[in-house]
């Protein structure tokens, strides 16, 4: 019953179980999803502009199940997707067409995860396996960040495939599954 997904590379299953805050309350309804929280948030970089709307690092709420192979969390979790461009686009003259064209100038800023939170989830697995406790790292806030060559490129990917950490002690399942099936599937509503 319920079948929509969205992958987020910034989200990962954390094998260690430590002390973390309790998870937030579950969503009452899906009207809270896909909300642009900070569409006009103040810039986090020193561009000089009078138009704050030029900065569009948005925090979009979404809800998803955490899955790992054939296992799925008992309840969905809610986190953020970082969306939008950072920095004003400068209006520059276009010599060929005698018109104007947009080109970003100045340092390269991206809307990427800023802070994370950890949440404990219970993974349900088929075949009578006992539920497994897992920690997942969820995006808690987004920020316009200046890119450097030392930046972790995974922060910039548009929700590509994430390789899961190997699972200790997992019994091999007789069912044939695609190679991707053992990845930590991060399935979300968007």
């Amino acid at each position: 019953q319920g079948w929509q997904a969205f992958k987020n590379d910034a989200t990962e299953i954390i094998p260690e179980l430590g002390e973390y805050p309790e998870p937030p309350p579950e969503l009452e309804n899906n009207k809270t999803m896909n909300r642009a929280e900070n569409g006009g948030r103040p810039p986090h970089h020193p561009f000089e502009t009078k138009d704050v709307s030029e900065y569009s690092c948005r925090e979009l709420h979404f809800t998803r199940y955490v899955t790992d192979g054939p296992c799925r969390s008992a309840k969905p979790v809610t986190e953020l997707v970082c969306s939008g461009q950072c920095g004003p686009a400068r209006l520059l003259p276009n010599a060929i067409g005698r018109g104007k064209w947009w080109r970003p100038s100045g340092p390269d800023f991206r809307c990427i995860p800023d802070r994370y939170r950890a949440q404990r989830v219970q993974l349900l697995c088929p075949g009578g396996e006992a539920p497994r406790a897992r920690k997942v790292r969820l995006v808690a806030s987004c920020k316009c960040k200046r890119l450097t060559r030392f930046h972790n490129q995974s922060e910039l990917k548009d929700f590509g495939t994430e390789a899961a950490r190997p699972q200790k002690g997992r019994k091999p399942r007789p069912r044939a599954r695609s190679a991707k099936a053992n990845q930590a599937e991060l399935e979300n509503a968007y």
Partner: antibody, heavy 118, light 112 residues
Framework: CQSVEESGGRLVTPGTPLTLTCKVS????????MNWVRQAPGKGLEWIGA?????YTYYATWAKGRFTISRTSTTVDLKMTSLTAADTATYFC??????????????WGPGTLVTVSS | AQLLTQTPPSVSAAVGGTVTISCQSS????????LAWYQQKPGQPPKLLIY???TLASGVPSRFKGSGSGTQFTLTISDVQCDDAATYYC????????????FGGGTEVVVK
């Protein structure tokens, strides 16, 4: 705009294999859970199976072995074998609210009709 | 295999009245709340009304209310409108040897 549309439904004779295709637009299949559901004329809905974003598939008990769900970058396929008249139905492709079952299916295609008759 | 039994198979209601549809599951759904309700009109695909047993889907009027837990669920339509004439289905998600979903047999609502 997000949409799904099924194709491949036609009149086939019993025993003929048939593959239905669900073409999606406006979202990525690599980050979606897709389901196949069928409905015989004048009857109720019947869940066939699903494919999760990581490629994991699961099926209704009655569909195992005879139905196979797979996907490409833009399509989800339902391969059916050993068809009988009882498989005559409209076949729906559906994308849901949350991943991997649990939140209700919110995006349905119009369906494609499969008729099995000799 | 899991069995979802809907009752009644058909029900008639007057405009402004109330309709109650029951959905009984042969085993508990996942998390006791992985159950959804759909509305389907002839020639159309189903439309999601309720998910997680009681959560109203986006754009669905509050006249539709889902309740229940575990194996017993109810869809209540209050202040019935002509547009509510349709067939309603429950759908549950289960976990045993593998994941599976199942639909109820459907309830036809006729509005007088």
């Amino acid at each position: 705009c997000q949409s799904v549309e099924e194709s491949g439904g036609r009149l086939v004779t019993p025993g003929t294999p048939l593959t239905l295709t669900c073409k999606v637009s406006g979202f990525s299949l690599s980050s979606s859970v897709m389901n196949w559901v069928r409905q015989a004329p004048g009857k109720g809905l019947e869940w066939i199976g699903a494919i999760w974003s990581g490629g994991y598939t699961y099926y209704a008990t009655w569909a195992k072995g005879r139905f196979t769900i797979s996907r490409t970058s833009t399509t989800v396929d339902l391969k059916m074998t050993s068809l009988t008249a009882a498989d005559t139905a409209t076949y729906f492709c559906a994308r849901g609210q949350f991943g991997a079952s649990g939140g209700g299916d919110v995006l349905w295609g119009p369906g494609t009709l499969v008729t099995v008759s000799s | 295999a899991q069995l979802l039994t809907q009752t009644p198979p058909s029900v008639s209601a007057a405009v402004g009245g109330t309709v109650t549809i029951s959905c009984q599951s042969s085993q508990s759904v996942v998390n006791n709340n992985n159950l959804a309700w759909y509305q389907q009109k002839p020639g159309q695909p189903p439309k999601l009304l309720i998910y997680f047993a009681s959560t109203l889907a986006s754009g669905v009027p509050s006249r539709f209310k889902g309740s229940g837990s575990g194996t017993q669920f109810t869809l209540t339509i209050s202040d019935v409108q002509c547009d509510d004439a349709a067939t309603y289905y429950c759908q549950g998600t289960y976990l045993s040897d593998d994941w599976s979903d199942a639909f109820g047999g459907g309830t036809e609502v006729v509005v007088k």
